[in-house]
Amino acid sequence: APVRSLNCTLRDSQQKSLVMSGPYELKALHLQGQDMEQQVVFSMSFVQGEESNDKIPVALGLKEKNLYLSCVLKDDKPTLQLESVDPKNYPKKKMEKRFVFNKIEINNKLEFESAQFPNWYISTSQAENMPVFLGGTKGGQDITDFTMQFVSS
């Protein structure tokens, strides 16, 4: 069966939107009005992995781009990157582990934990216009809570 996907945007708990910053980076900033069109639309795919009521394995691709968020070790540190893939082969039910995030729902907020690096989360800074990154702390200065907005296909 083909992998199930939905289109959505994400905003952090401070209402910052995610936009492209160069070809392989996302940044978070406050957008208003027509600028909202700049925000990236994700194709969120529901993939194979350990699942529970509040934890669902997903892959986050950029809609109509052959780019996926992936988590790899760079200089011994878990790092978030945008990785290009062959569009003929993606998305797929069995994604490589670096592409998988555990989507965790807590109090109407979402966290995205790396399946490859437990307790590392997609994060944004308090500051404006900073890169989206993989953070190893929750509940500190950095933001790990998001809301999801559905986008029609």
């Epitope: 350990e50 990785e83 290009s84 893939v85 670096r98």
Partner: antibody, heavy 120, light 107 residues
Amino acid sequence: QVTLKESGPGILKPSQTLSLTCSFSGFSLSTSGMGVGWIRQPSGKGLEWLAHIWWDGDESYNPSLKTQLTISKDTSRNQVFLKITSVDTVDTATYFCARARYDPPWFVDWGQGTLVTVSS
Amino acid sequence: DIQMTQTTSSLSASLGDRVTISCRASQDISNYLSWYQQKPDGTVKLLIYYTSKLHSGVPSRFSGSGSGTDYSLTISNLEQEDIATYFCLQGKMLPWTFGGGTKLEIK
């Protein structure tokens, strides 16, 4: 010091099930990011990746053999197992287990291999 | 599946030579390439990972380079103990696939 050692039946007949064990020391499969894979090599030929199991139980298989393969682990006993059902003479090979941490994988440590012959 | 091609299946060189072994992927593999040495007794060792990073304990005469679809392993000053077969492995996409190997012999 990391060591891995494969064990198997040596010889078995076509249509039987091949059961392989990888016993390892020097690392734990409960460590985040850790994985163990199986790779085989027919005599005088190249290497073929078969299956991989991660610390969290996540499994990956080579689709060309997926219906025949089952990988599993016993974390407390430091062992990983591979079962291949309905073997044929083409499955005659040396079978290696190897350790890789994180994806993309680099197989950092390898066992010495165990030769399996399928013959009627 | 991603095909990994090592066009040279065997290579003959003299001690002290600089030897280059190449590996080509059927599509871009984002530098997710590692190199392995298999000695005549069957022992396999990791040499290089992530295209160019030298695994700990591997002599510095070994180096790796490449990008996109084309990758290479270089031995700068061939020694007797380097007589072995060398394999590349792509980790970009499941199933992970090896090159066919390049057997290195002494002239």
